[in-house]
């Protein structure tokens, strides 16, 4: 082992204080006791150490805790967290939501780093499920967090946690994710009355099946076009012109602007032209009058 340089006389640190910002790297290494550092970690964040000095402090903690830091140290890492690698973080056992919040605060305003992703993964796995408080915290720091999870991971979200989800949290979710989230949302909001229910469920409707959309069409919900355009194409196709008209209410005229885009384009192709004409929007491409519509999926099922 390389012989360590001795601490110069009078420079041994008795506490973690601002005098240490004037220590050279080798002096920090020689004069700061790792155990002292661990017990006074909460001071480190209040002192403007350079990145090079933080490297030294991290090294001292690594030597003291080769199996991973205890939560009492993790909670007070502050900017030292930015020095941690995903490998370091995999050694941790983080159970306190306060610790998670403290570390997310350090990374606030930045993209989710590999360190943060690993931290969240460790935390959620430790808890066993994505409970409401955790989801609340994660989506507050990272609105896109929910949509970064796989459908399998989303399946561990309990319906009660859905209350914490804001519309913007679902902006980047794909249909497979909404397929998982929608039934949970339906369950979570089931006791709400019509208009309140629609406000809450609206963001999740990209995962709704046809029968639920039909039911909504009977409730005067006035769905906006942006929401309609995010619906599953296979759920929209079986809706009748009358059902779509009721579903959209005054927003129905927006169909004209979207007639070349899915799911509107595909839905138009499935409707009788004379039914489309009743909307008075000039929608073209429906099935000409007198043509017989065969439900091929039904035919295949019978044969």
């Amino acid at each position: 082992e390389v012989e360590k340089t001795a601490c110069p006389s009078g420079k041994k640190a008795r506490e973690i204080d601002e005098s240490l910002i004037f220590y050279k790297k080798w002096e920090l290494e020689a004069c700061v006791d790792a155990a002292l550092l661990a017990t006074q970690m909460d001071r480190v964040n209040a002192i403007p150490f350079t990145y090079e000095q933080l490297d030294v402090l991290k090294h001292k903690l690594d030597e003291l805790y080769p199996q991973g830091y205890p939560e009492s140290v993790i909670q007070h890492l502050g900017y030292l967290f930015l020095k941690m690698s995903p490998e370091d973080i995999r050694k941790w056992n983080v159970t306190s939501l306060e610790t998670l919040k403290a570390l997310l605060e350090v990374n606030k305003g930045h993209e989710m780093s590999p360190q943060v992703a690993t931290l969240i993964d460790r935390f959620v796995k430790g808890r066993g499920q994505l409970d409401k408080d955790t989801l609340d915290t994660l989506t507050a720091f990272y609105p896109g967090y929910l949509c970064s999870l796989s459908p399998e991971e989303l399946s561990s979200v309990p319906p009660s946690s859905i209350w914490a989800v804001r519309p913007q949290d679902l902006d980047t979710c794909d249909p497979r994710q909404l397929d998982v989230l929608y039934p949970k949302a339906r369950l979570a909001f089931q006791n709400m009355n019509g208009s309140e229910y629609f406000v809450k469920i609206q963001s999740f409707l990209g995962g709704a099946p046809t029968e639920d959309l039909k039911a909504l069409s009977q409730q005067n919900v006035s769905m906006d076009l942006a929401t309609f355009m995010k619906l599953r194409t296979d759920a929209v196709l079986p809706l009748t012109v009358a059902e779509v008209q009721k579903l959209l209410g005054p927003h129905v005229e927006g169909l004209k602007a979207e007639e070349r885009h899915r799911p509107v384009r595909d839905w138009i192709l499935r409707q009788r032209q004379d039914d489309l004409d009743t909307l008075g929007l000039g929608l073209q491409g429906g099935i000409p009058n007198g043509y017989l519509v065969l439900d091929l999926s039904m035919q295949e099922a019978l044969s």
């Epitope: 005098s19 004037f22 209040a46 002192i47």
Partner: antibody
Framework: EVQLLESGGGLVQPGGSLRLSCAAS????????MSWVRQAPGKGLEWVSG????????YYADSVRGRFTVSRDNSKNTLYLQMNSLRAEDTAVYYC?????????WGQGTLVTVSS | QSVLTQPPSASGTPGQRVTISCTGS????????VSWYQQLPGTAPKLLIY???KRPSGVPDRFSGSKSGTSASLAISGLRSEDEADYYC???????????FGGGTKVTVL
């Protein structure tokens, strides 16, 4: 016991000069940054200057930059403030304080009066 | 005009809790630690709170400090007559490259 003892204050005419000293004891002076803070009569605290242990960088308030110079002699455990081109608004009690980010020990202060 | 903003005065009766606010910006309180100083009449200032919430030895636990974002506050619980003094907040300012104080808050015990 940490002690800071200022000296050198007094009455000086506008445009004149004065040199304040602060003798430190009870701690390893050469390890710590030091600062000067002043307080005009009946007013609040105003930071004047700061100097790290090795005198590498020196920091000044805009109100004194170019007129005041901070220095230290670690072998004598003493902090200095050379004040030139003094103005009436420099009239204040001048304190020396240990550290630069949180002043954990203060001297009793020395009064500087700039008046004709 | 001080860089950090404090209320000029605060008061309370003995035993009450008094809170003093200190508002700064993203160049001082935001990234840096806040300290609080007590100045009794006719004496030099004394450090009361450092590193946002730490108390030096000898300072009663009736005094507590906290920081959130670009603001900080000092709370005095169980107010006593000997707490009548001027209280200053302070922080390093990264843009000014210097230390800044609040204008001070005079605490009166009624």
């Amino acid at each position: 016991e940490v002690q800071l003892l200022e000296s050198g204050g007094g009455l000086v005419q506008p445009g004149g000069s004065l040199r304040l000293s602060c003798a430190a004891s009870g701690f390893t002076f050469s390890n710590y940054a030091m600062s000067w803070v002043r307080q005009a009569p009946g007013k609040g605290l105003e930071w004047v200057s700061g100097i790290p242990p090795d005198s590498g960088s020196k920091y000044y308030a805009d109100s004194v930059r170019g007129r005041f110079t901070v220095s230290r002699d670690n072998s004598k455990n003493t902090l200095y403030l050379q004040m030139n081109s003094l103005r009436a608004e420099d009239t204040a009690v001048y304190y020396c304080a240990k550290n630069m980010l949180s002043f954990d020990y203060w001297g009793q202060g020395t009064l500087v009066t700039v008046s004709s | 005009q001080s860089v950090l903003t404090q209320p000029p005065s605060a008061s309370g009766t003995p035993g009450q809790r008094v809170t003093i606010s200190c508002t700064g910006s993203s160049s001082n309180i935001g990234p840096n630690a806040v300290s609080w100083y007590q100045q009794l009449p006719g004496t030099a200032p004394k450090l009361l709170i450092y590193y946002n919430s730490k108390r030096p030895s000898g300072v009663p636990d009736r005094f507590s400090g906290s920081k959130s974002g670009t603001s900080a506050s000092l709370a005095i619980s169980g107010l006593r007559s000997e707490d009548e003094a001027d209280y200053y907040c302070g922080s390093w300012d990264s843009d000014l490259r210097g230390y800044v104080f609040g204008g001070g808050t005079k605490v009166t015990v009624l």
